[in-house]
């Protein structure tokens, strides 16, 4: 028989889980390091890609499952999952805390912008930054 479809976690549930695993914790997963993730529209997929490389860490298994469900929920978000800082590694707990901040913002304010709008904004910001450095 087909396996039951697991309902996608809500942002509220993800927040609760992230709070749960970071509360009063100085470290997670024995201080394992992962690639840093830019806070973009593809955060869930990018965070998952980064955290998926952490094995033997039961503390983040539920988070990994939730991110997997949220990432597969939006194909558009999956397409930009490579939005990572390949030159920066941070501790797992820092990545999880960054994710918590981002998700709280989305939960609270709603995803006001469409993905295209966000990319447009990022392009403009990159151009302004690039242009600025050209003149200094």
């Amino acid at each position: 028989s087909p396996s039951p479809v697991t309902p996608s976690p809500t942002l509220k549930e993800l927040i609760e889980e992230l709070v749960n695993i970071t509360q009063n914790q100085a470290s997670l997963c024995n201080g394992s390091m992962v690639w840093s993730v830019n806070l973009t529209a593809g955060m869930y997929c990018a965070a998952l890609e980064s955290l998926i490389n952490v094995s033997d860490c039961s503390a983040i298994q539920r988070t990994q499952r939730m991110l997997k469900a949220l990432c597969s929920q939006k194909p558009a978000a999956g397409q930009i999952s490579s939005e990572r800082s390949r030159d920066t590694k941070i501790e797992v707990i820092q990545l999880v805390k960054n994710l918590l901040t981002y998700v709280r913002g989305v939960y609270r304010h709603g995803n006001f912008r469409g993905l295209n709008d966000i990319f447009e904004a990022q392009k403009i910001e990159w151009h302004e930054h690039h242009h600025h450095h050209h003149h200094h």
Partner: antibody
Framework: ELTLQESGPGLVKPSQTLSLTCVVS?????????WDWIRQRPGRGLEWMGS?????WYNPAFQGRISITADTAKNQLSLQLSSVTTGDTAVYFC???????????WGQGTLVTVSS | QSVLTQPASVSGSLGQRVTISCSGR????????ANWYQQVPGKAPKLLVS???NRPSGVPDRFSASNSANSATLTITGLQAEDEADYYC???????????FGGGTQLTVLG
């Protein structure tokens, strides 16, 4: 009509803890909304301090010395800010945050002066 | 210094149209847009327009807001004397992990 009313001592000594209460009337303090504290220092802009909801969270700028709690039975919100300095002299507002709207209800604010 | 930049002051004559800008970045306005508040000196701020364009009942349709890329703009048409106040934009910043406000803009209505 929902109303929010802040109260607390108008004068606090440096290094002490500032304690304020926000009483909500005409509605309930529930986790359907987020209930925030925002302050405004003299001649300055608005500064978010923290939010009470299922998972209370704070502005990292205040982390370690702030506590926001709610007593849903009494329909009130509380703010505690420890180790205050003269830089904490401000008008303190409580406000309700509604998703997709913003801060739709505010208290009238209460002035707290930190001075010895 | 605020991460959301607003002009310190703007002025306009009665009946005129004025705009107040709020400049941010991708990690605040670029993602979450901005809400706008009006504050009369000595009073609490009052919500004018949300990032979704919602206006609370009681707020005249002379007040409107728009968002483009990493900035937001509040437009007031048919300026009236009672519009003289401070105006604040507000968003969420993922880098700071905090709700953020612009520094505020003082609007002066010229007689």
């Amino acid at each position: 009509e929902l109303t929010l009313q802040e109260s607390g001592p108008g004068l606090v000594k440096p290094s002490q803890t500032l304690s304020l209460t926000c009483v909500v009337s005409g509605g309930s303090v529930t986790n359907t909304y987020e209930w925030d504290w925002i302050r405004q220092r003299p001649g300055r802009g608005l500064e978010w301090m923290g939010s009470w909801t299922d998972n209370t969270w704070y502005n990292p700028a205040f982390q370690g010395r702030i506590s926001i709690t709610a007593d849903t039975a009494k329909n009130q919100l509380s703010l505690q800010l420890s180790s205050v300095t003269t830089g904490d002299t401000a008008v303190y507002f409580c406000a309700r945050w509604t998703k997709r709207w913003g801060y739709d209800y505010w208290g009238q604010g209460t002035l707290v002066t930190v001075s010895s | 210094q605020s991460v959301l930049t607003q002009p310190a002051s703007v002025s306009g004559s009665l009946g005129q149209r004025v705009t107040i800008s709020c400049s941010g970045r991708t990690n605040n306005i670029g993602y979450f847009g901005a809400n706008w508040y009006q504050q009369v000196p000595g009073k609490a701020p009052k919500l004018l327009v949300s990032s979704y364009g919602n206006r609370p009942s009681g707020v005249p349709d002379r007040f409107s807001a728009s968002n483009s890329a990493n900035s937001a703009t509040l437009t007031i048409t048919g300026l009236q004397a009672e519009d003289e106040a401070d105006y604040y934009c507000q968003s969420f910043d993922t880098t700071l992990g905090a709700v953020v406000f612009g520094g505020g803009t003082q609007l002066t209505v010229l007689g």
